[in-house]
C-alpha cells in the first residue's frame, strides 16, 4: 500500500509481513497470524493485531497477563476470530468450546458459555475513558496545554478525528481522556476509536506498533509528560449482560 | 507571522566544514520539528534531515550521513546544520524548513513542511 | 527510491483545471511552490490535503495509498511555477519528486 519500492514494511503496523507482490510491484503487507492484507497508511484494526500477536512467539510477548481482579479488560490476551473486515466476530470462543460475546474493542460483555451461546450483533463501543497517572513533576501541567498535546497527538499520530476527542480532564497526577464515536458519527475512513486507544496504550506501555521514529515523545511546553500506569474503562452503546453472581 | 532565517551561507573549500544557522520566530519553536533542504544549482529540492521538538531525535539523507549534524537551541529558537567534510556536490542553498506534525508515525516526511526560510547560498571551490 | 514521480511539465489554459499526480512515497505527501530557480518555495498543501490559510482555495490535496494529486481548479496565469511533491521512503528518509513545470497557455 504505502510503503516504498525501495524497502518494503508497513509503517504504521510493526506486526504484518511485506513482500512486494501487489499491483504493479507495490508493495503488500500482511497481518501476522491471519494473512490479511492491510492498508500501511492507516491503524490496522486491534482485533487483527491482537490475533498478530498471539501468534508471535511467546518471548516476544512482553506483557504480563492481567489477573482475575483487574479492573479492565480482565480477560486479558486471547486470540480472537476476525471478520474479514478485520472486526471482532461478536461472538468468541476457545480451545475448550467456552465462548462469550464481545463488544467492538473486543472486550467480554457477558457471562462465559457453551457453544450453545448466541451473541446476535456486534455490539459498539462508543465511549472510552483513558485513565493516566504521569511520574511526579516539579508542578502541575498547565491544562489548557497538557489538552492541546493530548488532542494534538491524537490528530497526528492515530489520525482521529479532532471531534471524537471528546474532552481531556485533569486533577494532577491523573489524566483522563474522553473518546467519544456513535455509530452514526463515524464515516467510511474515520479511524476507529478503539483502534486510537488500542495504540495509545501500546504506546504508553513502550510497546509501539509503529516503525520509524518509535515511541511516544510527550511533551508539555518542553516539559516530558511520563505515563506510570494506565487504565481504560469502556462504555457500550448497549449495557452488558453479566449475571448478578459476577457483580457480587 | 513565522518566519525563518538562515545564516553561514558563503564560498567554502572542499574538505572543510560549514555551519548553517536558522534563526525562527512567529510560533513556538519548542512544539515543532525544524528541516534542513538544499538545491543544488538548476536542480530540484533534496531532504537533508530533521530533528524533533526536544532534540532527542534526528534522521539524515544518505548522502550527508555520517558528515552532517543537525542540532537546535529551543532557548534561543534557533537550529543548526554542522557539515563535514565539504564536497563539491553540496553546492547549493540550504533551507530551514518548520514541520508540522510532530507525533506523526511519518513526521520526517516531507510531506509535513509547512513554511520555509529564504535560504541562504552556499559554494564549494577551491 | 531516490525521488518521487510526478510529471515534467503540464500546460492549461486560463481557467482549466489542472491535476499533477506524484507517487511512491510513504506516508503524508506535501505541495510546494517554486516560482524561480533561487527563490524560496512555498508550501501549497501539507499533510495530504491541509491547505495554509493564505493559498487560495482553488488549490486542493489528495492522498490514495502511495499516490497524490495536486488540483487547481480554475488555473491563473500567476500561478504558473515549478510544483515538487514531498514524502518520504519506507525507511524514514525525506523525498521530493523531481518538479513539474505548469504552463499556463
Known amino acids: 500500500h504505502t510503503a516504498a519500492q525501495d524497502n518494503c514494511t508497513c509503517p504504521t503496523n510493526k506486526m504484518t509481513v511485506c513482500s512486494p507482490d501487489g499491483p504493479g510491484g507495490r508493495c503488500q503487507c500482511r497481518a501476522l497470524g491471519s494473512g490479511v492484507a492491510v492498508d500501511c497508511s492507516t491503524l490496522t484494526s486491534k482485533c487483527l493485531l491482537l490475533k498478530a500477536r498471539m501468534s508471535a512467539p511467546k518471548n516476544a510477548r512482553t506483557l504480563v497477563r492481567p489477573n482475575e481482579h483487574a479492573l479492565v479488560d480482565n480477560d486479558g490476551l486471547y486470540d480472537p476470530d476476525c471478520d474479514p473486515e478485520g472486526r471482532f466476530k461478536a461472538r468468541q470462543c476457545n480451545q475448550t468450546s467456552v465462548c462469550w460475546c464481545v463488544n467492538s474493542v473486543g472486550v467480554r460483555r457477558t457471562d462465559k458459555g457453551d457453544l450453545s451461546l448466541r451473541c446476535d450483533e456486534l455490539v459498539r463501543t462508543h465511549h472510552i475513558l483513558i485513565d493516566l497517572r504521569h511520574r511526579p513533576t516539579a508542578g502541575a501541567f498547565n491544562h489548557s496545554d497538557l489538552d492541546a498535546e493530548l488532542r494534538r497527538l491524537f490528530r497526528e499520530r492515530y489520525r482521529l478525528h479532532p471531534k471524537f476527542v471528546a474532552a481531556v480532564h485533569y486533577e494532577q497526577p491523573t489524566i483522563q481522556i474522553e473518546l467519544r464515536q456513535n455509530t452514526s458519527q463515524k464515516a467510511a475512513g474515520d479511524v476507529d476509536i478503539g483502534d486510537a486507544a488500542y495504540y495509545f496504550e501500546r504506546d504508553v506501555k513502550g510497546e509501539s506498533l509503529f516503525q520509524g521514529r518509535g515511541g511516544l515523545d510527550l511533551r508539555v511546553r518542553g516539559e516530558p509528560l511520563q505515563v506510570e500506569r494506565t487504565l481504560i474503562y469502556y462504555l457500550d452503546e448497549i449495557p452488558p449482560k453479566f449475571s448478578m453472581k459476577r457483580l457480587t | 507571522a513565522v518566519t525563518l532565517d538562515e545564516s553561514g551561507g558563503g564560498l567554502q573549500t572542499p574538505g572543510g566544514g560549514l555551519s548553517l544557522v536558522c534563526k525562527a520566530s512567529?510560533?513556538?519553536?519548542?512544539?515543532?520539528?525544524m528541516f534542513w533542504v538544499r538545491q543544488a544549482p538548476g536542480k530540484g529540492l533534496a531532504w537533508v534531515g530533521v530533528i524533533n521538538r526536544s532534540g532527542s531525535y534526528t534522521n539524515y539523507a544518505p548522502a550527508v550521513k555520517g558528515r552532517a549534524t543537525i542540532s537546535r537551541d529551543n532557548g534561543q529558537s534557533t537550529v543548526r546544520l554542522q557539515l563535514n567534510n565539504l564536497r563539491a556536490e553540496d553546492t547549493g542553498t540550504y533551507y530551514c524548513?518548520?514541520?508540522?506534525?510532530?507525533?506523526?508515525?511519518?513526521?520526517?516526511?516531507?510531506?509535513?513542511?509547512?513554511?520555509w526560510g529564504h535560504g541562504t547560498e552556499v559554494i564549494v571551490s577551491s | 527510491a531516490l525521488a518521487l514521480t510526478q510529471p515534467s511539465s503540464v500546460s492549461a489554459n486560463p481557467g482549466e483545471t489542472v491535476e499533477i499526480t506524484c507517487s511512491g512515497g510513504s506516508g503524508n505527501y506535501g505541495w510546494f511552490q517554486q516560482k524561480s530557480p533561487g527563490s524560496a518555495p512555498v508550501t501549497v498543501i501539507y499533510n495530504n490535503n491541509y491547505r495554509l490559510s493564505d493559498i487560495p482555495s482553488r488549490f486542493s490535496g489528495s492522498a490514495s495509498g502511495s499516490t497524490a494529486t495536486l488540483t487547481i481548479t480554475g488555473v491563473r496565469v500567476e500561478d504558473e511555477a515549478v510544483y515538487f511533491c514531498g514524502s518520504a521512503d519506507s525507511t524514514y528518509v525525506g523525498l521530493f519528486g523531481a518538479g513539474t513545470t505548469l504552463t499556463v497557455l
Open positions: 524548513a518548520k514541520g508540522v506534525c510532530t507525533h506523526c508515525w511519518d513526521a520526517d516526511s516531507a510531506g509535513n513542511i509547512d513554511a
Open positions: 512567529g510560533f513556538d519553536f519548542i512544539d515543532y520539528d
